[in-house]
């Protein structure tokens, strides 16, 4: 089943080189990996590894194609009907509560507990207590962050030239 | 209390290589990114390159590759770099720098000077 | 690379004033951007993360917005010791790169 995407789902994208036309819009929507013209007549193909669209839509511009950030792999690349998929770099995954961060995985449990659960590009290794079986959740205590330059010597004045 | 307490200053001649040491208190590097950024007299920062000490992965800024290299003790909880074929210009502070995301620094040291002279 | 530009080089403002520094990135790097303060001597020292989360421990006074291109960090009202140099720095992509740095200064 289709869902519909229109035009005030996205931000428009300027179009950088012509594209090649297609068939006539059906019903006023034109397919997957298209977008309609401005007079509505024809349906543009997106710009492959540029832009895409999922599904029938009424779309002035196709969808901006996601870059991977520093802190992901790419696992496929955007095509015209897909956007990229991105995850978490080995060693890292993406909290819920911030979706747009890759977190490194801690590498140990807490004292009294054991490691019950591998990282994964979605979750933190998985510890329980030794006893009880419980949970834990939350971070290692020197793992958090508060920030603060170390203390030591002053390294050199560091000024701005020009 | 999470501190990076890098090695002493250091005077070397063209040429020479130098290798500088951070060792951090406080948290288990492998559970962290550890960076490093140089500083050049009355200059700005230039990041120079990222490992992760859980497995070893680095990434270096082109224009430091085969300049710098970066590795880690995991047993002594100590981070290093080493410069080769110093230059004047390679003269700068550099820090050692946390992070518990690969995409900002929380925690830097109070850096090491490397001046580069004859 | 993505080059980070930072205006003005040098800003002159009052204590107690408000003080204003631009970032701008040579792409959109979405909100993948963090603002740091160097005093004299010092290590520098995170302030604001992700264009505009604030840090444990920075007071609240420090405020950064914007998103893509365009990056603000705002400084409420002036105290003595925020006269320093800011750099920002985006995460985005690889390498990592830093602005050239503003010096607030005592006007």
């Known amino acids: 089943e289709s869902a519909l995407i229109t035009q005030q789902d996205l931000a428009p994208q300027q179009r950088a080189a012509p594209q090649q036309k297609r068939s006539s819009p059906s019903e006023g929507l034109c397919p997957p990996g298209h977008h309609i013209s401005e007079d509505g007549r024809d349906c543009i193909s997106c710009k492959y590894g540029q832009d895409y669209s999922t599904h029938w839509n009424d779309l002035l511009f196709c969808l901006r194609c996601t870059r991977c950030d520093s802190g992901e792999v790419e696992l496929s690349p955007c095509t015209t009907t897909r956007n990229t998929v991105c995850q978490c770099e080995e060693g890292t995954f993406r909290e819920e509560d911030s979706p747009e961060m890759c977190r490194k995985c801690r590498t140990g449990c807490p004292r009294g507990m054991v490691k019950v659960g591998d990282c994964t590009p979605w979750s933190d290794i998985e510890c329980v207590h030794k006893e009880s079986g419980t949970k834990h959740s939350g971070e290692v205590p020197a793992v958090e962050e508060t920030v603060t330059s170390s203390p030591g010597t002053p390294a050199s004045p560091c000024s701005l030239s020009g | 209390e999470v501190q990076l307490q890098q090695s002493g200053a250091e005077v070397v001649k063209p040429g020479a290589s130098v290798k500088l040491s951070c060792k951090a208190s406080?948290?288990?590097?492998?559970?962290?990114?550890i960076h490093w950024v140089k500083q050049a007299p009355g200059q700005g920062l230039e990041w120079i390159g990222r490992?992760?000490?859980?497995?070893?992965?680095?990434k270096y800024d082109p224009k430091f590759q085969g300049k710098a290299t970066i590795t880690t003790d995991t047993s002594s909880n100590t981070a290093y770099m080493e410069l080769s074929s110093l230059r004047s210009e390679d003269t700068a502070v550099y820090y050692c720098?946390?992070?518990?995301?690969?995409?900002?620094?929380?925690?830097w040291g109070q850096g090491t000077l490397v001046t580069v002279s004859s | 690379e993505i080059v980070m530009t930072q205006s003005p080089a040098t800003l002159s403002v009052s204590p107690g004033e408000r003080a204003t520094l631009s970032c701008r990135a040579s792409?959109?790097?979405?909100?993948?951007l963090h603002w740091y303060q160097q005093k004299p001597g010092q290590a520098p020292r995170l302030l604001i993360k992700?264009?505009?989360q604030s840090i444990t421990g920075i007071p609240a006074r420090f405020s950064g917005s914007g998103s893509g291109t365009e990056f603000t960090l705002t400084i409420s009202s002036l105290q003595s010791e925020d006269f320093a140099v800011y750099y920002c720095?985006?995460?985005?992509?690889?390498?990592?790169?830093f602005g050239q740095g503003t010096k607030l200064e005592i006007k």
């Open positions: 720095q985006q995460g985005n992509s690889w390498p990592y790169t």
């Open positions: 490992i992760d000490p859980a497995n070893g992965n680095t």
């Open positions: 406080g948290f288990n590097i492998k559970d962290t990114f």
């Open positions: 792409q959109s790097i979405s909100n993948n």
């Open positions: 992700f264009a505009s």
């Open positions: 720098v946390r992070g518990l995301y690969t995409y900002y620094f929380d925690y």
